[in-house]
């Protein structure tokens, strides 16, 4: 139809034949005329979106081919245009195809299979192998453009389709199209680093790998040094791959080949997509030389009861990792290295714990236990003073020539010796007797041994038959020794002496 315009206004060009659509048989001549005093050019956009130009007002295409199907536009110098759509009908080529098919999740995707013959029926989309299309897939056919798949789903990824139509009752199919779906971004990227802190010596190589995961390749990522303002780090190696559909992974490897002390700081791996951003930080500390720092031990003086177990535990930080650990008992090297383990599973861990288990300790095993640890750059030590608490043991209980009764006991802590007298009728000795003399002797070579206490009483104070009890006690327990007396006239005789250990 001829375009119309108001009098006095520039009018669009006229096209002959004066219709909006034209059907030409393939092999025939296509002839179009543009009528306009200010004619400028004819343009034709191919299926591949190529622009073909003709500056003659007549467009003549001898032996027209199906690929010449499309919109022909005539323009004038006023910028006004008129168009006609031409179908070049080819029995051997019903569909114009050749472009791949991509679609974005939640958007529409155009299957480019325009028809060369509008006089066909049931223009539609089918699955390549004759199976049913997904039940939720809807499409809208347009003979001049192709078939639009509405609201593409991720599940349609790799779906193989053909365009189809019926000509004279016969179904015709296009070549295959395999839909590639690009995921819609509905979440921020996932960003991770294996270590959140790193400790290095000057000159060591610092390497940290940041892993970025997202549904598509359009994620942006980078390493930044917080200085404290973020500075982009350019010397980063990138690796990336698809772990599967909609599972894209990228690795950004930051390397500082010879770390300096002033390289210390916070490094941020940053990633963003159209939904938002995510980041993770890792801290680098570069030290001039290695070190060992032993954490303060709450109590280096340890008291343990005879026969019991005790753990001597040392926590320390070391970098580089400790090379030698050793326990020394009373300044003599022990074969026992203790049990050494790292404080956490962190790969860059510098915190260690060493535990020496002393089992069923004897009274003779008290003393100094020293833990020594060293690495290539430093060494450190800590000493425990272990005291073994032992129940008093009465070593001797004698009647001396001078009439004294003497009791000697050992134990740790220092035993207290108490004396009691009781008559034969009493079940228990409860009458206290004051000692005449008390002496503490340290017979041990070291200050950690048992303490010996000697106590004496004067037997002449006793006027009746009975029993004298020497009782040695400390925090651990008590032991007793008994002296039995009988009077024969004026003579007092020690009849019997025996000990009784009270648990």
């Amino acid at each position: 139809s001829q375009p119309s315009a108001s009098p006095g206004e520039p009018s669009p060009p006229s096209i002959h034949p004066a219709q909006s659509e034209l059907i030409v048989e393939a092999g025939d001549t296509l002839s179009l005329t543009c009528i306009d005093p200010d004619f400028v050019r004819w343009t034709f956009k191919t299926y591949f979106n190529e622009m073909v130009e003709n500056k003659k007002n007549e467009w003549i295409q001898e032996k027209a081919e199906a690929t010449r199907t499309g919109t022909y536009t005539c323009s004038n110098s006023n910028g006004l245009t008129s168009s006609i759509y031409v179908f070049v009908r080819d029995p051997a080529k019903l569909f114009l195809v050749g472009l791949p098919l991509f679609g974005k999740e939640d958007s529409d995707a155009l299957v480019r299979c325009p028809l060369t013959d509008p006089q066909v029926s049931n223009y539609s989309l089918i699955e390549c192998d004759g199976k049913s299309l997904p039940t939720d897939l809807t499409f809208v056919p347009n003979p001049k453009a192709g078939i639009t798949i509405k609201n593409v789903k991720r599940a349609y990824h790799r779906l193989c389709v053909r365009c189809a139509a019926q000509r004279d009752g016969t179904w015709l199919h296009s070549d295959k199209f395999t839909l590639k779906v690009r995921a819609a971004i509905k979440a921020i990227p996932v960003v991770s680093v294996p270590e959140t802190s790193h400790l290095l010596k000057k000159g060591d190589t610092f390497t940290v790998v940041c892993t970025i995961k997202d549904v598509s390749t359009s994620v942006n990522s980078m390493w930044l040094k917080m200085n404290p303002q973020p500075q982009h780090i350019a010397q980063v190696k990138h690796n990336s791959w698809h772990r599967g559909d909609f599972n894209y992974e990228r690795q950004e490897t930051l390397t500082i080949s010879s770390a300096r002390v002033d390289d210390s700081g916070v490094f941020m791996c940053y990633a963003n997509n159209t939904f938002g951003s995510a980041n993770v930080t890792t801290t680098l500390k570069v030290v001039e030389k290695g070190f060992i720092n032993i954490s303060p031990v709450k109590n280096t003086t340890v008291f343990v009861t005879d026969g019991e177990n005790v753990d001597l535990v040392v926590e320390y930080e070391a970098y580089p990792k400790p090379e030698h650990q050793q326990w020394i008992y009373m300044n003599r090297t022990s074969a026992n290295k203790g049990k050494d383990y790292v404080k956490s599973d962190n790969k860059s861990n510098i915190r260690y714990v060493n535990q020496l288990r002393l089992t069923r300790l004897k009274g003779t095993e008290g003393g100094t236990y020293t833990f020594l640890v060293s690495n290539s750059d430093a060494s450190a030590s800590v000493t425990f003073n272990v005291y073994v608490n032992t129940k008093p043991e009465i070593l001797t209980y004698d009647r001396l020539i001078n009439g004294m009764l003497q009791c000697v006991a050992e134990g740790f802590p220092e035993p207290t010796i108490d004396w009691y007298f009781c008559t034969g009728a009493e079940q228990r000795c409860t009458t206290p007797v004051s000692p005449v003399d008390v002496q503490v002797q340290n017979v041990s070579v070291s200050p950690f041994g048992k303490l010996v206490v000697q106590s004496s009483i004067d037997s002449s104070v006793f006027r009746h038959n009975g029993t004298v009890e020497c009782k040695a006690s400390n925090d651990v327990g008590k032991s007793s020794a008994f002296f039995n007396f009988a009077f024969k006239g004026n003579n007092k005789e020690q009849i019997q002496a025996h000990t009784l250990f009270t648990p």
């Epitope: 472009l99 098919l101 995707a109 155009l110 894209y248």
Partner: nanobody, 119 residues
Framework: EVQLLESGGGLVQPGGSLRLSCAAS????????MGWVRQAPGKGLEWVSI????????YYADSVKGRFTISRDNSKNTLYLQMNSLRAEDTAVYYC????????????WGQGTLVTVSS
């Protein structure tokens, strides 16, 4: 103004290799999908390959799959097509083109570079 300039075409024997390059300017290359299209003498246009903006997703027409490799260097704004095991039927003018993902078509083209495979 979008400009795409192809280079690297020439005469090569069957079984040989060629590497085409395409220098891009006038747009933000690193965020655009790109591709190669070819036109054999007397024939219509045929898409060859497409690559996504980061250079990870690559797609090939069945006729070149396993022989051609598309790649890109976003720092140099350059697209490449490595062509191995060339055949006589690969003879064509090869065009570098910007692929519009949303409309499923190429929206800008280069002038093309001729590749002739002949003994």
């Amino acid at each position: 103004e979008v400009q795409l300039l192809e280079s690297g075409g020439g005469l090569v024997q069957p079984g040989g290799s060629l590497r085409l390059s395409c220098a891009a300017s006038g747009f933000t290359f690193k965020v655009e999908d790109m591709g190669w299209v070819r036109q054999a003498p007397g024939k219509g246009l045929e898409w060859v390959s497409i690559i996504d903006s980061p250079g990870i997703g690559t797609y090939y027409a069945d006729s070149v799959k396993g022989r051609f490799t598309i790649s890109r260097d976003n720092s140099k704004n350059t697209l490449y097509l490595q062509m191995n095991s060339l055949r006589a039927e690969d003879t064509a003018v090869y065009y570098c083109a910007k692929w519009n993902f949303d409309s499923n078509q190429f929206d800008y083209w280069g002038q093309g570079t001729l590749v002739t495979v002949s003994s």
